[in-house]
């Protein structure tokens, strides 16, 4: 499966929207930094097959969608930007779903990528617990936004790599 160029552009647009969503001066949030333990090894294209990497990307975008779809998230961010962000994520989910099913049979996906999907879910679980512990404070959301931007940037670079390998 060749990930369409539009997917990469969508990922870039999602990153730009995330960057625009900041509401407070992030300089006041240094003390709220936290180690979420981004599962970098899951996205390592050298260690895992393409289908597994794509499956992990899919899970990450799905979890990002879930995280930013909550009531607490809606209260934290600008509604217009959030809606645009949802559209970009939704489009990426569609691109990746088509790609995963093309790479391997649907019934094989769940078994084959169980570990990588679980690692991504645990990562987002840590993010959710952090937000809960910080009572969804503006700084906690800023830290999470920065973290999601970093993980998106990382996966975008790897997706470029996956396209080049074809």
């Amino acid at each position: 499966c060749d990930l369409p160029q539009t997917h990469s552009l969508g990922n870039r647009r999602a990153l730009i929207l995330l960057a625009q969503m900041g509401r407070i001066s992030h300089f006041s949030c240094l003390k709220d930094r936290y180690d979420f333990g981004f599962p970098q090894e899951v996205f390592d294209g050298n260690q895992f097959q393409k289908a597994q990497a794509i499956s992990a990307f899919h899970e990450m975008i799905q979890q990002t969608f879930n995280l930013f779809s909550t009531k607490d998230s809606s209260a934290a961010w600008d509604e217009t930007l959030l809606d645009k962000f949802y559209i970009e994520l939704f489009q990426q989910l569609n691109d990746l779903e088509a790609c995963v099913t093309q790479e391997v049979g649907v019934e094989e996906i769940a078994l084959m990528n169980e570990d990588s999907i679980l690692a991504v879910r645990k990562y987002f679980q840590r993010i959710t617990l952090y937000l809960m512990g910080k009572k969804y404070s503006p700084c906690a959301w800023e830290v999470v936004r920065a973290e999601i931007m970093r993980s998106f940037s990382f996966s975008t670079n790897l997706q470029k790599g996956l396209r080049r390998k074809d």
């Epitope: 960057a19 900041g22 001066s25 992030h26 300089f27 006041s28 949030c29 240094l30 003390k31 709220d32 930094r33 936290y34 180690d35 979420f36 800023e142 830290v143 920065a146 973290e147 931007m149 970093r150 940037s153």
Partner: antibody, heavy 121, light 107 residues
């Protein structure tokens, strides 16, 4: 390879203006903040201020607030430190350094080579 | 502002010695502390971040410990290239502040 390359040494007279630069390469310039650090001759390190190139938001040390201006041009991956009126006491080595922002990553992991500013009449 | 105080200001040691430098913060900074090495005419180099994490490429003879207000940088076996000035820096809040430095000299 991540690099921060600073502009060359400057010799100025008191009262003159100056703008020094720090160009980042080998990484996403807008994903990191750029901090500025002063080191006067034979002295220690002093943090001056920082900029987020993605939106040009800045924070200054109270000691340097109003004395210098930090700016950035993300289109050319460059941060700047400027003075409108130099004093002899501004004579120092000035370093720029990369900061991970709110991410859990090493602070000031890459530094520029430094720009020596000499202010003398 | 958070004050960072290093001790000693300077020390003399021999190659192979175990060297310990301490840094004290004027208030709790959790583990938001970094250690840098600077050699004459060169830019500082990050050694340790978040109190105890070794920066990539830094020899394992360097280690950091501590949390709250008291921190330590240890060089387990001093090498000729380790003679330099060492700075601690808090990164919990602005303004970011450095210790005054500890110069490690040859005995």
């Amino acid at each position: 390879e991540v690099q921060l390359v600073q502009s060359g040494a400057e010799v100025k007279k008191p009262g003159e203006s100056l703008k020094i630069s720090c160009k980042g390469s080998g990484y996403s310039f807008t994903s990191y903040w750029i901090g500025w650090v002063r080191q006067m001759p034979g002295k220690g390190l002093e943090w001056m201020g920082i900029i987020d190139p993605s939106d040009s938001d800045t924070a200054y040390s109270p000691s340097f607030q109003g004395q210098v201006t930090i700016s950035a041009d993300k289109s050319i991956s460059t941060a700047y430190l400027q003075w409108s009126s130099l004093k002899a006491s501004d004579t120092a080595m000035y370093y720029c350094a990369r900061h991970p922002g709110l991410n859990w990553a090493p602070d000031f992991d890459y530094w520029g080579q430094g720009t020596l500013v000499t202010v003398s009449s | 502002d958070i004050q960072m105080t290093q001790s000693p200001s300077s020390l003399s040691a021999s190659v192979g010695d175990r060297v310990t430098i301490t840094c004290r913060a004027s208030q709790s900074i959790a583990e938001f502390l970094n250690w840098y090495q600077q050699k004459p005419g060169k830019a500082p180099k990050l050694l340790i971040y978040f109190a105890s994490s070794l920066q990539s490429g830094v020899p394992s003879r360097f280690s950091g410990s501590g949390s709250g207000t008291d921190f330590t940088l240890t060089i387990s076996s001093l090498q000729p290239e380790d003679f330099a000035t060492y700075y601690c820096q808090q990164s919990i809040d602005f303004p970011l502040t450095f210790g005054q430095g500890t110069k490690v000299e040859i005995k």
